[in-house]
Interface confidence: low
């Protein structure tokens, strides 16, 4: 029976490196002469780089290397024919047999990855990310799909802001250069990256990285039409309300990032809820077309928001929006009013008072404190009624006389705000005077409805 023995040895091993042991079995007494075996290598295939790459210890069967030059990339396997002879190896009297020793040369990382070109080229549109810019290719003579072959790429220069990254394609071992942060053409029109390739494991001792382990990648940035932008955005201006139509408020212009494209920007109005404004399409000048009113329902917290569009004439055309916030300073353009507009009191004044409050759509200091008064005419008003200011916002209306017949009376109240100059208004308070129970509640509602109007008489 012909035996096959398998062993391994790393490439580049020094002479004297143990490889494997072969042993033969002899049924004779091992202590007798005819049982004492001796081993020798009969042949080695292939015979490169030397026909005697290995030796065998003739007594133990240990195979070791005796020559340098094991190189997996040249010879991946050696086949040795081993002869065992008894009678201590005496060729005349001894009996012999042969076996095969198959020695596989295993890979070590003795070959660095080398770029297939000194310079690679790629291009990227500005502002785009996650796209492949260039494909880097390397060669590596080590065993494919092992850590000694797998390439790891890094950018060693030319990318101070970290805009690029390189991933390895696990199948092809190529380096895929991708953009990970957007690039602005107006800032960087080209990048020249220095890239290096290494393996996943360090190179074997004594092996150096050659110049071919580095390369350059020349990336051209392509100019793309970008949105014009308003700055500042929002733009805040303070302006008194009540401005006449035709007043120039401000200029709200946009910048176009595309410095290398000859473009014009045109302005249009996107949103102007009260239709108070117009914008010059060429120079962005904003002019009023109506009176600005802080008290308008379109003004929230004193701020009026209008939105404008800046459009360029690039291909394709791009646009950006900007918000103008007009902080409207109050003027005293609203006269105060009295609330409620209707009230009830009893025929006899005790203990009834009508609490009234002021409503002014303006704000401090054009609102309260308010002054409350009764007119001099008709004389019955001041004769029958009295008004007492409780504080800046509240007053009380009371009957001055001890009795007033049930009915509905219109009491004019003069109310004046604290604006400079102040604004006054005469508010009519409809007072239902009625007969009341001991709790001060009206008992004759039906009769009041039919009663005629009086003016405090």
């Amino acid at each position: 029976l012909h035996q096959v023995w398998n062993g391994t040895v790393p490439e580049g091993s020094k002479p004297g490196t143990y490889v494997m042991t072969v042993t033969a079995i002899d049924a004779d007494d091992p202590n007798a002469l005819n049982g004492m075996l001796r081993y020798r290598i009969v042949s080695q295939a292939p015979s490169t780089p030397s026909p005697n790459m290995f030796t065998i210890n003739n007594e133990t069967g240990d195979i070791i290397t005796v020559a340098a030059g094991l190189d997996r990339e040249k010879v991946q396997q050696y086949t040795l024919i081993i002869q065992a002879t008894d009678m201590e190896g005496n060729p005349t009297y001894g009996l012999s047999n042969t076996a095969t020793a198959v020695i596989t040369v295993t890979d070590v990382n003795d070959n660095p990855p080398e770029f297939t070109a000194m310079t690679f080229y790629g291009e990227v549109p500005e502002n785009r990310v996650d796209i492949i810019v260039a494909n880097l290719t390397v060669t590596d003579k080590d065993q494919p799909h092992t850590p000694a072959w797998n390439a790891v790429y890094r950018i060693s220069g030319g990318d101070p802001t970290g805009r690029f990254a390189i991933q390895t394609d696990p199948n092809s071992n190529d380096g895929l250069v991708t953009v990970v942060k957007p690039i602005d053409f107006e800032t960087n029109r080209m990048f020249v990256l220095t890239v290096a390739a290494e393996n996943q494991v360090p190179l074997a001792k004594g092996i150096q990285h050659p110049p071919q382990s580095t390369a350059t990648v020349s990336v051209t940035v392509i100019d793309v039409n970008e949105n014009p932008y308003f700055a500042p955005n929002p733009k805040i201006i303070r302006q008194e309300e009540g401005l006449h139509a035709g007043t120039m408020l401000t200029t709200f212009t946009a910048q176009d990032p595309d410095r290398y494209m000859q473009q014009n920007i045109r302005y249009t109005k996107l949103s102007d809820p009260a239709n108070w404004l117009k914008i010059d399409p060429v120079n962005g000048q904003i002019t009023t077309i109506a009176v600005l009113d802080r008290e308008s329902p379109n003004v929230k917290n004193n701020i009026y928001n209008a939105t404008f569009l800046a459009s360029d004439n690039g291909i394709p055309p791009m646009s950006g929006t900007g918000t103008l916030q007009i902080y409207l300073l109050d003027i005293n353009d609203n006269a105060p009013q009295v609330l409620p507009q209707e009230a009830e009191t009893c025929e006899t004044p005790d203990p009834n008072s009508i609490n009234i409050t002021a409503l002014d759509y303006d704000i401090d200091p054009n609102a309260g404190p308010f002054a409350f008064d009764l007119p001099l005419s008709p004389v019955t008003i001041k004769r029958n009624w009295t008004i007492t200011r409780l504080n800046g916002d509240f007053a009380q209306l009371n009957l001055k006389i001890k009795f007033l017949e049930a009915g509905i009376y219109e009491v004019p109240i003069i109310i004046t705000d604290s604006g400079n100059p102040p604004k006054s208004n005469i508010s009519i308070l409809r007072v239902k005077v009625c007969q009341c129970d001991s709790n001060g509640d009206c008992t004759d509602v039906d009769r009041i409805v039919g009663a005629g109007l009086g003016t405090g008489a």
Epitope: N301, N302, P365
Partner: antibody
Framework: QVQLVQSGAEVKKPGASVKLSCKAS????????IQWVRQAPGQGLEWIGW????????KYNEKFKDRATLTADKSINTVYMELSRLRSDDTAVYFC????????????WGQGTLVTVSS | DIVLTQSPATLSLSPGERATLSCTAS???????LHWYQQKPGSAPRLWIF???NLASGIPDRFSGGSGSTDYTLTISRLEPEDFAVYYC????????FGGGTKVEIK
């Protein structure tokens, strides 16, 4: 930046008057109401009144309208609050504060002035 | 004048817990005019929440404000050590008043 800097601590006897100042900087003085608020030791906040430098309008808390006087010197962006006929329960930290653009909140405050009324 | 009543007067909680402070108005107050301030010992009050629910500049988003018709709340989702202070509500709708304050203290 917006700042309201108040005058230093005062010690007064009952019946006396005290005049506190609040100097504004970092904003247009005539565009904002300046409020005065006080805080007695361990107590809450109590509004005294406001002064509007734009028109000279003044509004007082009814409780203080007979004893508090608010004035201003627009040339030095300063508002004053004088409190007369001092009582021991007027011992408090007095703050000035700026009313914000809308909603009536106080967005910037002075550091406060301690007034101690003691015989 | 509108009276603002804050409850509880004192809230004893541990860091990491949720705090809910209440402010009840004696009559209706527009949400635009109800505000909250934080005050720490020896310092002026600082605007914390304005117009019921808007956080002032630099206030962390663990704070929030809300309202019913006359009830207003300030909520702190997870108390941090720096949140222990007195909080005041304030209205400027009719005249001008402050609540009595709620002291949030470490349990």
């Amino acid at each position: 930046q917006v700042q309201l800097v108040q005058s230093g601590a005062e010690v007064k006897k009952p019946g006396a008057s005290v005049k506190l100042s609040c100097k504004a900087s970092g904003f247009t003085f005539t565009d904002y109401l300046i409020q005065w608020v006080r805080q007695a030791p361990g107590q809450g906040l109590e509004w005294i009144g406001w002064f509007y430098p734009g028109s000279g309008s003044i509004k007082y808390n009814e409780k203080f309208k007979d004893r508090a006087t608010l004035t201003a010197d627009k040339s030095i962006n300063t508002v004053y609050m004088e409190l007369s006929r001092l009582r021991s329960d007027d011992t408090a930290v007095y703050f000035c504060a700026r009313r914000g653009d809308w909603g009536g909140f106080f967005d910037y405050w002075g550091q406060g002035t301690l007034v101690t009324v003691s015989s | 004048d509108i009276v603002l009543t804050q409850s509880p007067a004192t809230l004893s909680l541990s860091p990491g817990e949720r705090a809910t402070l209440s402010c009840t108005a004696s009559s209706s107050v527009s949400s635009s005019y109800l505000h909250w301030y934080q005050q720490k010992p020896g310092s002026a009050p600082r605007l914390w929440i304005f117009s019921t629910s808007n956080l002032a500049s630099g206030i962390p988003d663990r704070f929030s404000g809300g309202s019913g018709s006359t009830d207003y709340t300030l909520t702190i989702s997870r108390l941090e050590p720096e949140d222990f202070a007195v909080y005041y509500c304030h209205q400027y709708h009719r005249s001008l008043t402050f609540g009595g304050g709620t002291k949030v203290e470490i349990k």
